[in-house]
């Protein structure tokens, strides 16, 4: 039978005794920055071109004995996982290897930078098809390494990296923390986060998704026909690099933003046991395990969205947190979350010609997160409409008044430290879906978008008694763009989107006691694009 | 031995290029910053990536590197330019004493300087 990891990434319709992906990634070139490799291994011979690039530090220790098979071990295995004939993900992809790690698996930030520069220069000298760069390495947070990754990504290159094997927040490592890079954590055959000795896979908001990374069979540099199992986030990243190569081979025009959204969309959802992660990281860590799309074409009609969490604001009184979408994505809604419940809401604001989502901490709060809902919406024209706090007891309301604009998200932000907890709950007048409603002491922000064929609807789920979590999901064919809570009162910790479900969290009832105003309503805005659907049908 | 000769050549070149003149102070109001790895065992002091402002041309990068060498030589320090970056980020990789960081941060076009650090196979 096929190795568990190849079975896991194969969608059910392709499942058989063999791994038979629909396309082998033959139009794509994958660059591997790693150790040296054994290029005559039967898995990869003729598939991997060893470039003359080498930038590695000397090995530590005076008695270090350089043994070829040890020097090549890591890189050979990863090359096999990406494109190996027997145990590879993208069996048609061609690869180029650059040596940036020495025989002990150690390199430098500067050597990696020079390697990335080498790739960019190669791309300029001889433009080929889509490029994927696999970085199965990690160091401490590095501004310069992240900046280089950003530049290369903006030149149209897809970068995939290991989240790191430190059982820690991936945001503390580079290139894992670079927003433009696709950062991959590791899971095992039971879809659990991988433990590696006393450590394990990294986690947190800088991880985009997880992939198989334990007991992965692949080429061994011991001999030209040898295979071995290895584990780590490098192996997980290699799976995603292979999946990316296959997706790009099927649709070479995909942008990085489109590719990332598809990787997220086609992942297995909610299969990872989050109890493995530290409690404060669970909400930030994506519960996604990478998989191939069920078919290589026909995904274009869908409205794709993802959730982007900001860094923590920190606890100071005026602290704010900002979440940003990728350059090709539209910010369709903005929400906030605070574990202490002390926050002053969130707002969408322009920054450098693009909308960002900013959340505000409150006095005595431990800090907030901003949560952006970032979507692919071609030809979109979005704007934010704001209503200042209303004096009327009916609350503040704002709607999309421009012709053809639809409501994609609602945010509320208040200057007062505490919204009155005993104010009557605000009720939305029925039949006004294009309207955001909030507390009378809050300013309300409506995200209004015009895009061909875009239609949206509001879906609510209210629970009369206080509950820690209220959810509402969009139905099949609709995509969650906005997630907020009614009313915007202080016992609500915040709202955020998980896949296609809007989650509203409230303070633990046992600690707050019952309030007269325990009702919490989760409000989801669900959208779809008829235009994208039509365009897809015309293509087919 | 080879390295020592190389360093000697660098010093000669650096002294010769003093005609480049003193470094002007960076543009008013912009201060270059220094970054280093938060994980101490992973730090590689003595090697620095000097990152220049976004629109800096290759010739300016080379000139800035030579200027750093000249000013360092005047203070009795040997420096070695290991690589000049262009294509992704403008800047250069330099082997030098940490004593020269203050000087380097004042060079024109400098955006920030990062001490080199280790990366590891995962």
């Amino acid at each position: 039978s096929i190795p568990w990891n190849l079975e896991r990434i194969t969608p059910p319709r392709y499942r058989a005794d063999e791994y038979q992906p629909p396309d082998g990634g033959s139009l794509v070139e994958v660059y591997l920055l790693d150790t040296s490799i054994q290029s005559d291994h039967r898995e990869i011979e003729g598939r991997v071109m060893v470039t003359d690039f080498e930038n590695v530090p000397e090995e530590d220790g005076t008695r270090f004995h350089r043994q070829a098979s040890k020097c090549d071990s890591h890189g050979t295995h990863l090359a096999g996982v990406v494109s190996g004939r027997d145990a590879g993900v993208a069996k048609g992809a061609s690869m180029r290897s650059l040596r940036v790690l020495n025989c002990q698996g150690k390199g430098t930030v500067s050597g990696t930078l020079i390697g990335l520069e080498f790739i960019r220069k190669s791309q300029l000298v001889q433009p080929v098809g889509p490029l994927v760069v696999l970085l199965p390495l990690a160091g401490g947070y590095s501004r310069v390494l992240n900046a280089a990754c950003q530049r290369l990504a903006r030149a149209g290159v897809v970068l995939v990296t290991a989240a790191g094997n430190f059982r820690d927040d991936a945001c503390l490592y580079s290139p894992a923390s670079a927003p433009e890079v696709i950062t991959v954590g590791a899971t095992n055959a039971q879809d659990q986060p991988v433990t590696l000795g006393t450590l394990g896979t990294n986690f947190g908001r800088c991880v985009d998704l997880f992939a198989p990374g334990e007991d992965i069979i692949g080429a061994s540099s011991d001999c030209s026909t040898c295979f071995v199992s290895q584990s780590g986030t490098s192996q997980a990243a290699a799976h995603v690099a292979g999946i990316a190569a296959m997706m790009l081979s099927a649709e070479p025009e995909l942008t990085l933003a489109e590719l990332r959204q598809r990787l997220i969309h086609f992942s297995a959802k909610d299969v990872i046991n989050e109890a493995w992660f530290p409690e404060d990281q669970r909400v930030l860590t994506p519960n996604l395990v990478a998989a191939l799309p069920p078919s290589t074409h026909g995904a274009g009609w869908q409205l794709f969205c993802r959730t982007v969490w900001s860094a923590h604001s920190g606890p100071t009184r005026m602290a704010t947190a900002v979440a940003r979408c990728a350059p090709d994505e539209e910010l369709l809604s903005c929400s906030s979350f605070s574990r202490s419940g002390k926050r002053r809401g969130e707002r969408m604001e322009a920054q450098g010609g693009k909308l960002v989502c900013r959340a505000h901490n409150a006095f005595g709060g431990e800090g907030v997160y901003a949560i952006a809902r970032c979507c692919l919406l071609p030809q979109a024209n979005c704007s934010v409409h704001t209503a200042p706090p209303a004096e009327a007891s009916m609350g503040t309301r704002v709607h999309c008044h421009q012709q053809g604009h639809v409501l994609t998200g609602c945010s509320s932000h208040w200057e007062v430290e505490d919204l009155g907890t005993h104010k009557p709950p605000v009720l939305r007048p029925r039949g006004q879906p294009n309207q955001c409603v909030g507390h009378r002491e809050a300013s309300i922000h409506a995200s209004c978008c015009h895009a061909p064929g875009l239609e949206c609807k509001v879906k609510e789920h209210g629970i009369p008694a206080p509950q820690e979590q209220v959810t509402v999901a969009c139905e099949e064919g609709w995509t969650l763009t906005g997630c907020s809570a009614l009313p915007g009162t202080s016992h609500v910790l915040g709202a955020y989107a998980v896949d296609n479900t809007c989650v509203v969290r409230s303070r633990d009832v046992s600690t707050t006691g019952s309030t007269s105003e325990g009702a919490v309503t989760a409000v989801a805005i669900c959208c779809r694009s008829r235009h994208l659907a039509q365009a897809s049908q015309e293509l087919q | 031995q080879e390295d020592e000769d190389g360093d000697y050549e660098e010093l000669v070149l650096a002294l010769r290029s003093e005609e480049d003149g003193l470094a002007e102070a960076p543009e008013h109001g912009t201060t270059a910053t220094f970054h280093r790895c938060a994980k101490d065992p992973w730090r590689l002091p003595g090697t620095y990536v000097v990152v220049l402002k976004e629109e800096t041309h290759l010739s300016q990068s080379e000139r800035t590197a030579r200027r750093l060498q000249a000013q360092a030589a005047r203070r009795g320090y040997l420096t070695k330019i290991l690589h000049v970056f262009h294509g992704l980020l403008p800047g250069f990789l330099v082997k030098m004493s940490g004593d020269l960081l203050e000087l380097a941060l004042k060079l024109p076009h400098v955006d920030y300087i990062e001490e080199d650090s280790s990366v590891f196979a995962q």
């Epitope: 039978s1 096929i2 190795p3 058989a16 005794d17 063999e18 791994y19 038979q20 082998g24 039967r42 011979e45 003729g46 598939r47 098979s69 071990s73 004939r85 027997d86 145990a87 069996k91 048609g92 069979i217 061994s220 540099s221 011991d222 001999c223 030209s224 026909t225 040898c226 295979f227 071995v228 199992s229 | -």
Partner: antibody, heavy 119, light 113 residues
Framework: QVQLVQSGAEVKKPGESLKISCKGS????????ISWVRQMPGKGLEWMGI????????NYSPSFQGQVTISADKSISTAYLQWSSLKASDTAMYYC????????????WGQGTLVTVSS | DIVMTQSPDSLAVSLGERATINCRSS????????????LAWYQQKPGQPPKLLIY???TRESGVPDRFSGSGSGTDFTLTISSLQAEDVAVYYC?????????FGQGTKVEIK
């Protein structure tokens, strides 16, 4: 079920060309390597070479390099062994064999093709 | 090339008795990364293609009777038939698959005494 079916016995004259075949069924032919093994009358097994039908990558034993050509047509799940100029010493039973997954050892064998070269 | 040498060339054993075949490789086929020996054993009966019995030097292929066992490591290996049956009359080959070219031993003929 998984099987390899080889073409029938051949009687040829020295200097003639020949192409024998091995058709795979019951599995994804593209994803498994096929080896060719020679057994001369009353002798042992000799590995000749191997092909990966997915991309037609081949590896030959030095003893057979330049003497034979291994090829495959994945569209019809068939591997081939051919000679451009047969010699009397090529008289033997030729087996095709499928690799065990990611192990170059042979779990499925063809029934064999007897090639007789005689003037 | 790795040369495989089997001994004896032929072996006559009474029914129900133990048969032991040895195989030596000219270089080690044991690899440290997965601690496996890249050695297999095949059985070939007259007029039939060979059949895989053992791989990784000691792992029995599914469907193979448990009277067949493999042992050894590095360069020296043994195939043992614990209680010879009439249907075990055949030629047995060892094979290394650690590197190209793949090589076989010259074969050991097992007969009933």
């Amino acid at each position: 079920q998984v099987q390899l079916v080889q073409s029938g016995a051949e009687v040829k004259k020295p200097g003639e060309s020949l192409k024998i075949s091995c058709k795979g069924s019951g599995y994804s032919f593209t994803n498994y390597w096929i080896s060719w093994v020679r057994q001369m009358p009353g002798k042992g097994l000799e590995w000749m070479g191997i092909i990966y039908p997915g991309d037609s990558y081949t590896n030959y034993s030095p003893s057979f390099q330049g003497q034979v050509t291994i090829s495959a047509d994945k569209s019809i799940s068939t591997a081939y062994l051919q000679w451009s100029s047969l010699k009397a010493s090529d008289t033997a039973m030729y087996y095709c064999a499928r690799d065990y997954y990611y192990k170059p050892l042979f779990d499925i064998w063809g029934q064999g093709t007897l090639v007789t070269v005689s003037s | 090339d790795i040369v495989m040498t089997q001994s004896p060339d032929s072996l006559a054993v009474s029914l129900g008795e133990r048969a032991t075949i040895n195989c030596r490789s000219s270089q080690s086929v044991l690899y440290s990364s997965n601690n496996k020996n890249y050695l297999a054993w095949y059985q070939q009966k007259p007029g039939q293609p060979p059949k895989l019995l053992i791989y990784w030097a000691s792992t029995r292929e599914s469907g193979v009777p448990d009277r067949f066992s493999g042992s050894g490591s590095g360069t020296d290996f043994t195939l043992t038939i614990s209680s010879l049956q009439a249907e075990d009359v055949a030629v047995y080959y060892c094979q290394q698959y650690s590197s190209f070219p793949i090589t076989f031993g010259q074969g050991t003929k097992v007969e009933i005494k």
